[in-house]
Amino acid sequence: ACDTATCVTHRLAGLLSRSGGVVKNNFVPTNVGSKAF
């Protein structure tokens, strides 16, 4: 899977969208590695 910063950011945005934004406050691109997905 793509693990560039841009891929991580877009994947996280999708996850936030699907979850309705109900995730931890520190669940942001710069805190999340590709393995979190």
Epitope: T4, A5, T9, A13, V28
Partner: antibody
């Protein structure tokens, strides 16, 4: 409103260095990666590198062979791109850019900084 | 580095025309492609990410498709404000790379 505001135009001599700043506002600066991209006159866009402002880890385009250094000042929500050993081919517009999720999911770009390298 | 080859390099079109721009990657980049619009003297404006998703505020006449190595940006009905240069970008691997651009000109 998310904004990326860059420093003003620079004129440099060959062999000198230039440091361009990018002041971020309207979002949490440390939450999102910052990219630097340049565009020489009439040329395609060229990615230079990015930085994670949270842990200050950088990734660079090896084309620049150690000439580029990206840094941040977290307290000032500002990113910097320094390019050393300037040559005429480095004459370009330099942009900072960041993909933000909150408050608005978008790929934001600074207004650009023109760097002219001339003897 | 991954090469992104755009075609055509320029296209002349009229308001209301359908315009298609293609981008070919030198190796598989999945769906990790973005499209940008740039007007003279201005910063690039993001249109599409992940090959086919429009950013909020981008008109629905812009659409993207493709995966792997072949990608397309389509403007379904060209508007006066759409005359600009368009760039594709791959962000599947470092360094990110851009296509050479397609200039959409008034016929």
């Amino acid at each position: 409103e998310v904004q990326l505001v860059q420093s003003g135009a620079e004129v440099k001599k060959p062999g000198a260095s230039v440091k361009v700043s990018c002041k971020a506002s309207g979002y949490t600066f440390t939450d999102y990666y910052m990219n630097w991209v340049r565009q020489a006159p009439g040329q395609r866009l060229e990615w230079m590198g990015d930085i994670n402002p949270n842990n200050v880890v950088t990734t660079y385009n090896q084309k620049f062979k150690g000439r580029v250094t990206i840094t941040v000042d977290k307290s000032a929500s500002t990113a910097y791109m320094e390019l050393s050993s300037l040559r005429s081919e480095d004459t370009a517009v330099y942009y900072c850019a960041s993909i933000i999720i909150v408050p608005d999911y978008f790929d934001y770009w600074g207004q650009g900084t023109t760097v002219t390298v001339s003897s | 580095d991954i090469q992104m080859t755009q075609s055509p390099s320029s296209v002349s079109a009229s308001v209301g025309d359908r315009v298609t721009i293609t981008c070919k990657a030198s190796q598989n980049v999945g769906s990790n492609v973005a499209w940008y619009q740039q007007k003279p003297g201005k910063s690039p404006k993001a249109l599409i990410y992940s090959a086919s998703y429009r950013y909020s505020g981008v008109p629905s006449r812009f659409s993207g498709s493709g995966s792997g190595t072949d990608f397309t940006l389509t403007i379904s009905s060209l508007q006066p404000e759409d005359f600009a240069t368009y760039y594709c970008q791959q962000y599947n691997s470092y360094p990110y790379t851009f296509g050479g651009g397609t200039k959409v000109e008034i016929k």
